[in-house]
């Protein structure tokens, strides 16, 4: 079997919510991840809580891997195993997952200094929405390679998927709506794919009509003999995946083919504001892979609204203002911490920030309501003092950023948060100092003196 | 056998050109999409420019553009790199990768992240 592996290992957790952070799209059936290392001499190429798979379709640099190896070190024309899978994923935290991969041979590599190699790839989940990053070294001694990965699907998966059309729950921080894309009164789009043709009719449940009541999304008809007809994905097996700025509509569940698998369907999208047919677009067939069939389709309805398109700056006619450079994203960075001169070590209150984005959860803010852009923190517990949903201004010289739809905090109110950014030029360091709370716990002031909050460039035009 | 071999690498001054090349062997060449991308020193890879063989579409980095120019040879199953005016920046080993054209997202085609198959690299030296 072509596609079973030499080496692997579950590749899926649940958080302590019993929430499914599943890495199994990531896994490569052939070829391998490249890490991103900064030397040129030597490129250490991984793949996915699985061994590499070096006989089927062996790529020039992955040809001398030896089997079984999850992570593979070439160094000129020759390649070394410096890991296979041992231990199934880990959860080390709400945002961090961990697979280590060990050197089982017992002979040593020379240039290890005695050292039996390993790996260590953790999979961060990011604060905020963002396009896929490339795996990332971030330490090498002696054999021990420490990969950092920051990528959605380390998040759980109801962040990242839907059984319906649309994405746009709480959960998932962005709005997308395919449902405008469903044909009615029988008819489908056609794809062309050299000697088939792609029937497809996707977020409804219209039977094509080609397709012999088979439930089928996707229809495959063979142009030469129009009899041959087999369903590549079925309407009920449907799932749409937003992760690392890829949209997939999959349908999966259809006709068996010749190997034993049951035919699918992988539909990429692409935000095409000027898309034809309304729109709407249509599907281009792209090729198969293994009883898998890839389509793209441009439309205006993969046009994905985030929460983070809200801008992270401000104008005022030809000023400009860009507030990004206090934004934390992932880790190593940490949240901003408020300054509170107010209260004693016993009673203290900690504040943490981001700007323009969720505060990180990490430190003493770990336990902060997950979508919280401030959080305070005390020994009672954590609170979140407002979500950004709007866009910094520019307010009496100053810029202001309003965090809103926090924490209830009574008589149906939400607690609101304002922060007042100072101009301070030269200085990006600086914290931001709690100036009031009041109203009963329902709104909280901060000031911030900051470089960020001085005027950028005069805007062109 | 997926197979990918660069070539065409040197010294030149600053100012001159080179066409670097990638031979590939081992699969269906128009199932393919390949990508040229460069490593400096002490610096990530990064895509320079990118081909579909089978429709000709082609996407360039925006330090590229202007300067530099892909093409392909079908009957070669090569793809060729024609770089001209370069500078000492230019410097650093060239790599060709590829990835099956029909799970690619095209306007991706520069990002590290989309490829399978890596060739070994060439080395392009920009100095006087």
């Known amino acids: 079997d072509i596609f079973k592996a030499n080496k692997e290992v579950p590749c899926y957790v649940f958080d302590e919510e019993l929430r499914k952070h599943d890495l199994n799209p990531l896994i490569k059936l052939s070829g391998a991840y490249l890490v991103d290392d900064s030397d040129p001499d030597t490129s250490l190429f991984i793949n996915v809580c699985r061994d590499i798979d070096t006989l089927r379709d062996p790529g020039s640099q992955l040809r001398a891997c030896p089997p079984g190896t999850a992570a593979c070190l070439v160094r000129g024309h020759q390649a070394f195993d410096v890991g296979q899978p041992r231990d199934g994923l880990k959860l080390v935290r709400k945002d961090r997952l961990v697979l280590s991969y060990v050197r089982e041979e017992a002979g040593k590599l020379d240039f290890c200094d005695g050292h039996s190699p390993a790996v260590t790839i953790t999979f961060v989940c990011p604060s905020e929405r963002r396009e896929g990053t490339i795996p990332k070294l971030t330490a090498k001694s002696n054999c021990r390679y420490e990969i950092e990965w920051i990528t959605e699907y380390a998040c759980h998966r109801d962040y990242l998927e839907s059984k319906t059309c649309s994405l746009s729950g709480e959960q998932q921080d962005v709005s997308i709506d395919l449902t405008p894309l469903a044909q009615s009164g029988g008819s489908s789009y056609i794809s062309d794919g050299k000697e088939y043709l792609f029937y497809l009719n996707v977020c409804g449940e219209t039977e094509i009509q080609f397709c012999n009541k088979k439930q089928a999304a996707v229809c495959q008809v063979k142009k030469s003999d129009t009899s041959q007809v087999k369903a590549a994905g079925r309407y009920h097996n449907q799932t749409l995946r937003y992760s690392d700025g890829d949209l997939t509509l999959i349908y999966f569940g259809g006709d068996e083919c010749s190997s034993g698998f049951q035919r699918m369907s992988v539909i990429n999208f692409e935000c095409n504001k000027t898309a034809g047919n309304d729109g709407k677009g249509t599907p281009v067939f792209t090729g198969e892979v293994d009883c898998t069939y890839f389509f793209t389709w441009d439309t205006e309805y993969a046009c994905v609204k985030e929460k983070e398109d809200l801008l992270c700056g401000a104008t005022d006619g030809k000023k400009r203002y860009d507030l990004s450079a206090l934004v934390r994203h992932a880790e190593p960075e940490q949240n901003w911490e408020a300054v509170d001169g107010s209260q004693t070590e016993t009673e203290k209150k900690h504040f943490f920030i981001n700007i323009c984005h969720r505060v990180l959860q990490e430190g003493k803010a770990r336990g902060c309501p997950e979508d919280a852009a401030v959080c305070a923190v005390d020994k009672n517990g954590s609170k979140n003092l407002g979500k950004f949903i709007s866009s910094p201004m520019k307010e009496k010289g100053n810029i202001q950023l309003s965090y809103s739809d926090g924490d209830d905090c009574g008589h149906g109110k939400k607690i609101k948060t304002n922060i007042t950014l100072v101009c301070k030029p030269g200085d990006l360091e600086s914290a931001p100092v709690l100036r009031t709370s009041g109203e009963g716990g329902c709104f909280y002031e901060f000031e911030w003196h900051t470089a960020a909050a001085c005027v950028l460039s005069k805007t062109e035009g | 056998q997926v197979q990918l071999q660069e070539s065409g690498g040197g010294l030149v001054q600053p100012g001159g050109s080179l066409r670097l090349s990638c031979t590939a062997s081992?699969?269906?060449?128009?199932?393919?999409?390949i990508g040229w991308f460069r490593q400096a020193p002490g610096k990530g890879r990064e895509g320079v420019s990118c081909?579909?063989?089978?429709?000709?579409?082609?996407y360039y980095h925006d330090s590229a553009k202007g300067r530099f120019s892909i093409s392909r040879d079908n009957a070669k199953n090569t793809v060729y790199l024609q770089m001209n005016s370069l500078k000492p920046e230019d410097t650093a080993v060239y790599y060709c990768?590829?990835?099956?054209?029909?799970?690619?997202?095209?306007?991706?085609?520069?990002?590290?992240?989309?490829?399978?198959?890596w060739g070994q690299g060439t080395q392009v030296t920009v100095s006087s």
């Open positions: 990768a590829a990835v099956n054209r029909a799970s690619m997202r095209f306007r991706r085609c520069l990002q590290v992240l989309r490829y399978d198959y």
């Open positions: 081909l579909d063989v089978d429709d000709g579409s082609i």
């Open positions: 081992g699969f269906t060449w128009d199932s393919y999409v």
